[in-house]
Interface confidence: low
């Protein structure tokens, strides 16, 4: 019968001679050269050669276990004289023994990962994996241990799983957003002499709302003409927020001040500015300065960061109302006067008064719009507004006179106002009756 054990052969042999595998031997072999050993199967005659007299097998080439771990061959022992087999053909195995000739290789050259800023220590970031082509069933050639080469003390890696976790408290995106971590995978359980490979992990801290809005200045001042209609924007304020996205969104509100009912603030969603607008008609003569307290706040707040302080800030907004030069204002919308038809020339009928409503109280002069009094029947004292006749009247000719009086600011002739005057001519018995006279 055949006499051998399973053959083992170390891979990656570097010797100058052929590598000895083992010996095929039949108990029928008496050592007299009467038997001939024949090898067939995987690599026979090429990779593996046999001394047909002695049964010694040698490998002619360097073998790579990772390419082929097992070779299955067949052995024959033939009687040289008869040409007959002295043993039944038998299959045998050459098993290639592993050496540590493969370094761990990561599944990706570069990994990309994100983790929220300010995460607790130990927060999962990403798992990296390296594989080793060596034999995992024998020795530690394929036992991979992970370690961090660059990226401490921010991140750590679990040596057995390749799970990267945060290693520092309060990692702040606003201070630093990008981290490049280099992870090493080393075989032989990380021991000396192990082979290693590395990968880069680009980690980005994603934003959380850990920063409140902050006004860059405590006081703002804007001016607006008193003529600004409701809805007019009069100024923009902007609080800055170091966060990004919805964490940096800001809402503005007026929380206090004399102008609470006079102004509004709206948030410009695009620029994240607060736009102060006029809410009610302003009047310089009534109030010249308003002081508001405007608040900027984050609409989306993370409760766990409330200990950092309120997620809002306030600023004082001072609004100065600008005077707009307004025309004189008459004491009445219209005047109705009466005069007897027998009034003498220069008889005073009445008077009108107008006043500059501006704080300057500019003096006013009066005149009659001659388009409304072509016959120049009436006149006005330009200084005091007294209306008097400049011609004799006749009720029978015209019962009502409708004229317009103009009031003009002396210092600013562009500012003028008009008012209608309705003058009624009262009847005087100055006409004899007319009729047909008949004789007796």
């Amino acid at each position: 019968s055949w006499m051998w054990n399973q053959f083992f052969l170390l891979e990656e042999y570097t010797g100058s001679d052929y590598q000895y595998v083992g010996k095929l031997h039949s108990d029928q072999d008496r050592g007299d050269g009467s038997l001939k050993y024949i090898l067939s199967g995987d690599g026979a005659g090429d990779l593996f050669i046999i001394n047909e007299n002695t049964g010694d097998i040698q490998a002619t080439k360097r073998l790579d276990r990772e390419e082929k771990p097992v070779y299955i061959l067949r052995a024959q022992a033939i009687n040289r004289r008869t040409g007959r087999p002295v043993e039944p053909e038998s299959e045998f195995i050459i098993k290639i023994h592993d050496i540590n000739d493969n370094e761990p290789i990561f599944t990706k050259e570069v990994y990309t990962a994100t983790v929220p800023e300010m995460s607790d220590v130990g927060t999962f970031v990403v798992q990296v994996t390296a594989t080793d082509a060596d034999d995992p069933t024998y020795g530690n050639s394929a036992k991979v241990v992970y370690s961090i080469l660059q990226g401490q003390p921010y991140f750590s890696v679990e040596s057995e799983t390749g799970i990267i976790k945060t290693a520092l408290l309060n990692m702040d995106r606003e201070n630093r957003e990008q981290y490049q971590v280099v992870i090493q995978a080393k075989d032989m359980g990380g021991q000396m002499g192990g082979l290693s490979g590395t990968t880069t992990v680009n980690i980005t801290l994603t934003d959380v709302n850990d920063n409140p809005p902050r006004f860059p200045q405590s006081t703002y001042q804007f001016k607006t003409p008193e003529s600004s209609p409701p809805g007019t924007p009069i100024g923009r304020i902007k609080a800055s927020d170091a966060d990004v996205g919805e964490n940096a969104e800001i809402e503005y509100s007026i929380t206090d001040g004399e102008g609470l009912d006079m102004f509004d603030v709206i948030t410009d969603q695009e620029t994240q500015e607060g736009i102060i607008t006029v809410k009610k008609l302003l009047d310089f003569e009534k109030k010249k300065v308003y002081t508001l307290k405007v608040e900027a706040s984050n609409p989306y707040v993370e409760p766990r960061f409330l200990y950092l302080g309120p997620f809002k800030d306030s600023a004082t907004v001072r609004i100065v109302v600008e005077d707009v030069d307004e025309p004189p204002v008459f004491s009445k919308l219209a005047y109705i006067l009466q005069i007897r038809e027998d009034a003498q020339i220069n008889t005073t009928i009445g008077s009108v008064t107008a006043q500059d409503p501006d704080a300057a109280r500019n003096p006013v002069k009066y005149s009659v719009d001659r388009h409304t009094d072509m016959d120049r029947i009436f006149n006005i004292d330009s200084g005091n507004g007294s209306i008097f006749t400049s011609k004799l009247l006749d009720r029978e000719t015209l019962l009502w006179h409708n004229i317009t009086v103009i009031a003009t600011e002396i210092n600013n002739p562009k500012q003028s106002s008009r008012v209608p005057l309705y003058i009624k001519v009262l009847d005087v018995n100055d006409n004899a009756p007319t009729g047909l006279s008949t004789g007796a």
């Epitope: 309060n170 990692m171 490049q180």
Partner: antibody
Framework: EVQLVQSGAEVKKPGASVKVSCKAS????????MHWVRQAPGQGLEWMGW????????EYNQKFQGRVTITADRSTSTAYMELSSLRSEDTAVYFC???????????????WGQGTLVTVSS | DIQMTQSPSSLSASVGDRVTITCKAS??????LAWYQQKPGKAPKLLIY???TLQTGVPSRFSGSGSGSDFTLTISSLQPEDFATYFC????????FGQGTKVEIK
Amino acid sequence: EVQLVQSGAEVKKPGASVKVSCKASGYTFTRNFMHWVRQAPGQGLEWMGWIYPGDGETEYNQKFQGRVTITADRSTSTAYMELSSLRSEDTAVYFCARGVYGGFAGGYFDFWGQGTLVTVSS
Amino acid sequence: DIQMTQSPSSLSASVGDRVTITCKASQNIYKNLAWYQQKPGKAPKLLIYDANTLQTGVPSRFSGSGSGSDFTLTISSLQPEDFATYFCQQYYSGWAFGQGTKVEIK
């Protein structure tokens, strides 16, 4: 804009103590480490220690252990460095410097105070 | 403790020259290195961090390279305002500065 403004120059006798201040503005004082670095005339820079104003924890260079005390006043956003038992070789410009990271006493220094000259002479 | 060795300790150059300063760490510090510029009577100013990242506002003629234990600061075309002392600093483990390189006018 981040600013660190230090107190003025000091002249001290050997054996005395000196306390240098560093007032911070333009950022949340409690959220960044504050370091102290000194530079002897014509010499290089030497790290002395840090404080985390958020909780007052400190770390000192072994060389100065027992002689240096770093404190912080959160109400005024001011850090202080006190060096005792002064000797002539302590003559140097003392700088405060903000650590770039909020939650880590490592890293580089992104903003520096203007420096305070301390002269130790008898 | 990690020691930082800077070379040369001083150099003379002219405006427009390319200037290279090297810094060697006593052990592997990966890319945990910063470069600072200091002018007489002034505080150091951060130029480069993480070995090769330019600090905001620093002119692009400054660049940093290196990893592990050997690092270089390069000024591609020296300007009049660049005459100063340059320090490297490691922050891999604690803090240590190089002894400085003074760049003087030739």
